[in-house]
């Protein structure tokens, strides 16, 4: 805190602003009749150096000149960039107890002359916007530096505006706040930036441009689309633009897409016809503008227009499958299933499906509409039946897809051979097979069908299926495949009027089952024991069970138990064993085995056979 220099003055030579690397002489002089006492020799002037308000040096040893008691001159060197404060104090040497008294102070700024500004670029946003220029100032000067932006144009006019840089703000951009109007489209402008500070000045090279070079049009606005005759594939995009625009760029894409369709339109005058749109698809449209065919800059993209194209009638064919179940000697139940069309085929919201079942010879026809993707009917077992399904939206219906209803597993000669199911990873299974050996008619296609082996799955859940061309012998099934679940997989070979099938079980990942089967009863019949059990609950199976094991040993025996291994069949829940001694008490239990290993044992049951055993 410097008092207002009552005691004396401080001056700097050559100036209070010096270039980096220069030395300066600081002179501290006492005013007349100011000092410690009547003896001038007892006046000692000292110079203290402060950086950021922190005392860093006493320059006592840097005196280059001394008028004892009146003035002292100190030489300061190696000053760092920025500002340094020097304070001169009076030290009365005959009174050690009094602190030095401030006399006066001075700030010395060390910096560099400005470099010529470079890379000037100017823009005007929109025909009614204002010109703003930016530049690269070069190295920091550490001094207050004034920048003047000068723009010279037609009719010998020059406009200018100023800003400054210091340690608090940077000046490398100026908005002139004035507009270049389109009537100057052909005129040339010259812009230059001059930088001045206490150590020098410099000027940029002149930068020349035209109105068209710097005006960036405003993005188009009020974008809308009109679909011709409610067409889903053709529409006229319309928008508003600034008056001078001669070139537009249009980009559009379905909302879930990652790449844009790009179109250039010359002299579009706010209108452009698009002919390749996808019906019933959410699209995003954006437009950019330019004032000149070859030069100038593109505007920013407009705000997006998001809209859905109208519907058109569905195309493509439905993927149909079916199940046949005999009800009694003269009736059968047909369940038809089909997969939804993908959006590019549906081309709208599917309102219903038209289903037809027709007996070919007697011309009996059953027709219905449904909103579901399945349909079940009871029909006579006699006759040759065909089914067809088509999908309808608000604009029309797809062409019907036909399928002949045949006995899917009726022809042994059409059964595929060597069907295998291998776990590929957590969520798919690779199914392979060999073609039927002695088919008397050509295989038209294979159908791989799968369904989780859980209670009620046939009635509760529709099947999943894949159509495979006749020359392919494998399928990777992944739809609805979950780990630790066993699936029944059927491979159907279909000819024009017959079907053959082979079945296998498979899983995508397996573990040993959580528990073993529960023995519910042991009965003795004709010198054989029948073991009955309940299957392991579905969630505890953890994959496909390959076989069950029945273990037995004499009660209280320490010997290894005997065992009998049974191939797993879902329909089987009892098994005979015949090697037990009569009137000996046995302990029995069961386990289940998957490809991953054996389950813990199920419940133990004791039994003592009565009859005579072999």
């Amino acid at each position: 805190n410097i008092d207002v220099c009552k005691l004396g003055t401080v001056t700097v030579q050559p100036a209070p602003v010096i270039p980096l690397g220069s030395a300066a002489n600081i002179s501290c002089s006492l005013n007349p009749k100011q000092g410690c006492s009547h003896y001038p020799s007892s006046n000692e002037l000292i110079l203290l150096k402060f950086v950021n308000d922190v005392l860093v040096e006493n320059l006592h040893g840097k005196k280059v000149h001394d008028h004892t008691g009146h003035s002292s001159t100190f030489q300061v060197t190696n000053l760092s960039l920025g500002m340094t404060l020097f304070v001169c104090k009076l030290n009365c040497s005959n009174s050690q107890k009094k602190p030095p008294v401030p006399v006066c102070g001075v700030e010395i700024s060390v910096g560099v002359a400005p470099e010529p500004p470079q890379n000037i670029s100017c823009v005007q946003e929109g025909e009614n916007g204002t010109v703003a220029c930016s530049w690269n100032s070069g190295k920091v000067t550490y001094l207050k530096t004034n920048y003047t932006l000068q723009l010279s144009g037609p009719n010998n006019l020059t406009c200018q505006k100023q800003c400054f840089s210091d340690n608090r703000q940077n000046c490398n951009r100026l908005d002139l706040g004035i507009n270049l109007s389109p009537d100057l489209a052909e005129s040339r402008f010259i812009v230059r930036v001059t930088a001045i500070n206490d150590l020098g000045n410099s000027s940029s090279l002149p930068h020349t441009f035209t109105f068209l070079d710097i005006v960036i049009p405003l993005p188009p606005w009020d974008i809308r689309i009109n679909f011709l005759n409610a067409s889903g594939s053709r529409g006229t995009l319309q928008w508003e633009d600034e008056g001078q625009v001669v070139l537009n760029q249009l980009r559009y894409q379905p909302l879930n897409s990652t790449s844009w369709n790009m179109v250039n339109a010359t002299n579009a005058k706010g209108k452009y016809d698009l002919r390749d749109l996808r019906p019933f698809t959410e699209y995003e449209f954006q437009i950019s503008s330019k004032l000149h065919l070859s030069g100038g800059s593109w505007s920013n993209w407009s705000e997006s227009l998001r809209t859905r194209t109208p519907e058109e009638e569905p195309v493509g064919i439905l993927d149909i499958w079916y199940m046949k179940q005999d009800i009694d000697y003269d009736r059968q139940q047909i369940s038809l299933f089909w997969k939804s069309l993908n959006p590019s085929e549906a081309r709208g919201k599917i309102l219903h499906y038209q289903v037809t079942l027709q007996e070919v010879t007697k011309k009996t026809t059953l027709q219905n509409t449904t909103r579901h993707t399945s349909w079940t009917r009871v029909i006579p077992r006699t006759g040759a039946w065909t089914a067809s399904v088509s999908a309808a939206n608000s604009k029309g219906a797809s062409a019907p897809t036909h399928i002949n209803i045949v006995d899917l597993c009726g022809t042994g000669l059409l059964a595929p051979h060597q069907v295998s199911a291998k776990s590929e990873n957590m969520d798919n299974i690779l199914v392979t097979w060999q073609p039927p050996k002695k088919a008397d008619s050509a295989v038209r296609e294979y159908i791989v069908e799968w369904r989780a082996l859980q209670p009620g799955s046939i009635t509760k859940f529709p099947p999943h299926w894949l159509r495979i061309p006749p020359d392919n012998m494998s399928a990777l099934i992944s739809e609805n495949i979950k780990p630790y679940i066993c699936y029944e997989i059927r491979v159907h070979a279909l000819s024009e009027s017959q079907g053959g099938c082979s079945s296998i079980r498979g899983d995508s990942k397996h573990k040993a089952p959580v528990s073993g089967p529960h023995i519910t009863a042991i009965t003795e019949k004709k010198e054989r024991l029948f073991i009955s059990w309940t299957h392991i609950p579905f969630p505890e199976q953890r994959g496909c069970i390959l076989h069950y094991r029945i273990y037995w040993k004499e009660r209280d025996s320490t010997a290894q138990p005997e065992l009998c291994e049974i191939q797993y069949r879902r329909s089987q829940n009892s098994h005979p064993i015949s090697s037990l001694q009569p009137r000996v008490t046995y302990v029995l239990w069961m386990t289940a085995v998957t490809a991953a290993g054996e389950s813990p044992q199920g419940n133990e049951r004791e039994f003592c056979p009565q009859g005579k055993a072999n």
């Epitope: 010109v131 723009l151 406009c159 505006k161 002139l176 706040g177 004035i178 507009n179 270049l180 109007s181």
Partner: nanobody, 125 residues
Framework: QVQLQESGGGSVQAGGSLRLSCAVS????????MGWFRQAPGKEREFVAA???????VYPNSMKGRITISRDNAKNAVYLQLNALKPEDTAVYYC???????????????????WGQGTQVTVSS
């Protein structure tokens, strides 16, 4: 009502300086472009200097370096500093005001809505 009142004119020797003032009432100078024009006897009115509302100054190249336009928002006034005066600078100097934002418009007198009565500057050799 809007009024512009010029002052500071007078007679001066060649090489001398003058500072013309324009006091504005009824409008705020910082909201408008302010201009100075001059008219010598028997000649058309010509553009001398202008300052846009954004404080950008515009000068004819022929007078650049000899003139400076400035404004004082607190006093609601605009000034024109004339240096190194020549006999051909003799004219009536007018202050003008208008909502102008274009480069060319700042130098066109028909873009300015309000005008002062003028102040005479005479430079003798």
């Amino acid at each position: 009502q809007v009024q512009l009142q010029e002052s500071g004119g007078g007679s001066v020797q060649a090489g001398g300086s003058l500072r013309l003032s324009c006091a504005v009432s009824g409008r705020t100078v910082s909201d408008y472009a302010m201009g100075w024009f001059r008219q010598a006897p028997g000649k058309e009115r010509e553009f001398v200097a202008a300052m846009s509302s954004s404080e950008t100054t515009v000068y004819p190249n022929s007078m650049k370096g000899r003139i400076t336009i400035s404004r004082d928002n607190a006093k609601n006034a605009v000034y024109l500093q004339l240096n190194a005066l020549k006999p051909e600078d003799t004219a009536v100097y007018y202050c003008s005001m208008g909502p102008i934002a274009t480069f060319q418009g700042l130098a066109r007198q028909n873009e300015y809505h309000y005008w002062g009565q003028g102040t005479q500057v005479t430079v003798s050799s």
